[in-house]
Structures are given as structure tokens and as C-alpha cells.
Amino acid sequence: SGRGEAETRECIYYNANWELERTNQSGLERCEGEQDKRLHCYASWRNSSGTIELVKKGCWLDDFNCYDRQECVATEENPQVYFCCCEGNFCNERFTHLPEAGGPEVTYEPPPTAPTLLT
């Protein structure tokens, strides 16, 4: 981050494959960074004929593609797996698909939950 100190942020966490990968299914993830390393939040999902299938959410390692993005916006035209990343606590709660080539913006609102903190 260039600020010289380790960065900490929190992201919404989700893993559709939690049983196989031995993780929690959902909650909050506290991201603790190394010195001079940025950390981001991300979301990934599939869109099958308008049905949104959440794949993963959580902390994402230092990635210039995510710098200074306040909102989680996927820009690829029509991928098999949509991906967005952002900076700011819980910025991956809502996620949007806005293709660079133009087309309708689609925003996904999470259902209300009471998340638990991952350790």
C-alpha cells in the first residue's frame, strides 16, 4: 500500500466448495497483510441463464487489478466464472457485472444474514 504498515481489512467470506476444501462455508474474513502489501476483497460467481451461483468470496492478495476500486465490478464480457475485486471493508458484499463492451449493468444483492467471523 506504500504506507509502510501492515494493512488489515475485513471481507465477506463464502466458499461453495467448503466441505471438500475444509473451510467455513460463510462468514467474515479478517485479512491481515504484510508490510507494504495491499489486500483486497473479491467475489466470484457463475451466471447460468440468469441464475446466480456464488462460488467464492473473501480476501484477495495484493493485485494491481484491484487497486483503488471502491466497488466490486466484473468487466469481462461473458466468462464461465465472473470475478471482481475491490478495496474497502466488506466491499464484496454486493457485486456487479458491467461489461467493458457495454450492455446492461446487473447488480447482485446478498440476502440478509448474520455472518460469523472466521478465525
Epitope: 466448495n17 475444509r22 474474513e29 480476501c59 492478495l61 487489478n65 466464472v81 470475478f83
Partner: antibody, heavy 120, light 107 residues
């Protein structure tokens, strides 16, 4: 500095078992998953599975299910990979690799490798 | 399982050359892709994660690009120490899988 030090080379007979150790230092052992990868002579890399040091839960590649056991000792910051019913095709270099805490989970630190030779 | 296909399997190049290695996943893996370098008798070393992020300490002549199913590792100006084998690896879903490797040899 962050380091993974593996046990020495082993020579085993077919049907035997081998247990390879991987001692971690320079970081909080329980905060990072450990994966195992092997490489047969002249071949590519093959993922075997992982262990979560904090709780001990494991996940194995289907190919090794029933033959591999990964364990850990938090008091010594060491993980172990035991492979049983050895056959000649198991002759390989076995690596432990620490995985970053966060997605996309690259293997950022590797052990030096342990050569296991299976020969009658 | 997700198959990772690397090409070419080997490439002969000279110091100063630009070298490009490609990796294709059998299904979409978004940006869950890493590249490793391995020299004979040594453990692999992480070069690139998240398809395009350079690992700390890795020279900037290495770069990665791609997303979804098609990925590229580029060495902009090959140095003597870059002659090695390079592997791509997906961490999108278990079991994690590697490409078959690309050996970069001296021409």
C-alpha cells in the same frame, strides 16, 4: 526468515511405508495450510493433498486416497506425509509447500524436497 | 478435475529473446492461476500469482496475463538464469492441478 526443512532421502521396498517430515520456521505455523506435491524422475509436478495445521483436517487427491496420511505436530511446527503400500511408481521427490493465507492461494514457500526411492 | 495444458513443451531461445509460454485450463478458473519456475535439482519457485501479480523479489521481466481459460507467461528479455522449466497451476478447485511444464533451453 520463512523456511521449510524436510527430512532426508529414503530407500524403501515395495509394500512398505514412508513418512516424510517438513519442519516450518519463521512464521506462525497454524496460520498457513501446507500442501504436498511430488515429482517423479523427469516428470512434472503432481498435487497430493493438504493439511490445515490449526485443526488437523486434511484433503487428499483421489489418486492417493486410502494410501496417504497427512498429520501435524503443532508443538514442533512440523507436518508429516506418510505414504503406504509403496510401489516403484512412487519413486519421486516429495515437496511440502506453504500456501498463502488468502485467495488465490499460491504456494509461496517450498521445502527443499525429499527423495524417496522404491526398489526391491 | 480441471486439466491444465501448457505449450510448447520446450522452447529453445537465446539470451535477450522474448519468450512466451501459454497455459489453457479445461474449464474457467477466473484468475486462480500461478506460475512456477524450477531449476534442475531444486524446488519450484513462485513467480506469478492471480494470473498477473508478480511475487515479491521476482524480476519485472516476468509477466503474466489472462483470465478464464487462457493464460500467458512472458519473459521479456531472457537472462542466463532463466533457463529452467516453468509450470502453471490452478487453485480454483480441488484437486489442484499443474500443467505439464515448459522447458526453456539455450539455443
Amino acid at each position: 526468515q520463512v523456511q521449510l526443512v524436510q527430512s532426508g532421502a529414503e530407500v524403501k521396498k515395495p509394500g512398505a511405508s514412508v513418512k516424510v517430515s517438513c519442519k516450518a520456521s519463521g512464521y506462525t505455523f497454524t496460520s498457513y495450510r501446507m500442501h504436498w506435491v511430488r515429482q517423479a524422475p523427469g516428470q512434472g509436478l503432481e498435487w497430493m493433498g493438504f493439511i490445515v495445521p490449526s485443526g488437523g483436517s486434511t484433503g487428499y487427491a483421489q489418486k492417493f486416497q486410502g494410501r496417504v496420511t497427512m498429520t501435524r505436530d503443532t508443538s514442533t511446527s512440523t507436518v508429516y506425509m506418510e505414504l503406504s503400500s509403496l510401489r516403484s511408481e512412487d519413486t519421486a521427490v516429495y515437496y511440502c509447500a506453504r500456501v498463502s493465507r488468502y485467495a488465490p492461494e499460491p504456494m509461496d514457500v517450498w521445502g527443499q524436497g525429499t527423495t524417496v526411492t522404491v526398489s526391491s | 478435475d480441471i486439466q491444465m495444458t501448457q505449450s510448447p513443451s520446450s522452447v529453445s531461445a537465446s539470451v535477450g529473446d522474448r519468450v512466451t509460454i501459454t497455459c489453457r485450463a479445461s474449464q474457467g478458473i477466473s484468475r486462480w492461476l500461478a506460475w512456477y519456475q524450477q531449476k534442475p535439482g531444486k524446488a519450484p519457485k513462485l513467480l506469478i500469482y492471480a494470473a498477473s501479480s508478480l511475487q515479491s523479489g521476482v524480476p519485472s521481466r516476468f509477466s503474466g496475463s489472462g483470465s478464464g481459460t487462457d493464460f500467458t507467461l512472458t519473459i521479456s528479455s531472457l537472462q542466463p538464469e532463466d533457463f529452467a522449466t516453468y509450470y502453471c497451476q490452478q487453485a480454483f478447485s480441488h484437486p489442484w492441478t499443474f500443467g505439464g511444464g515448459t522447458k526453456v533451453e539455450i539455443k
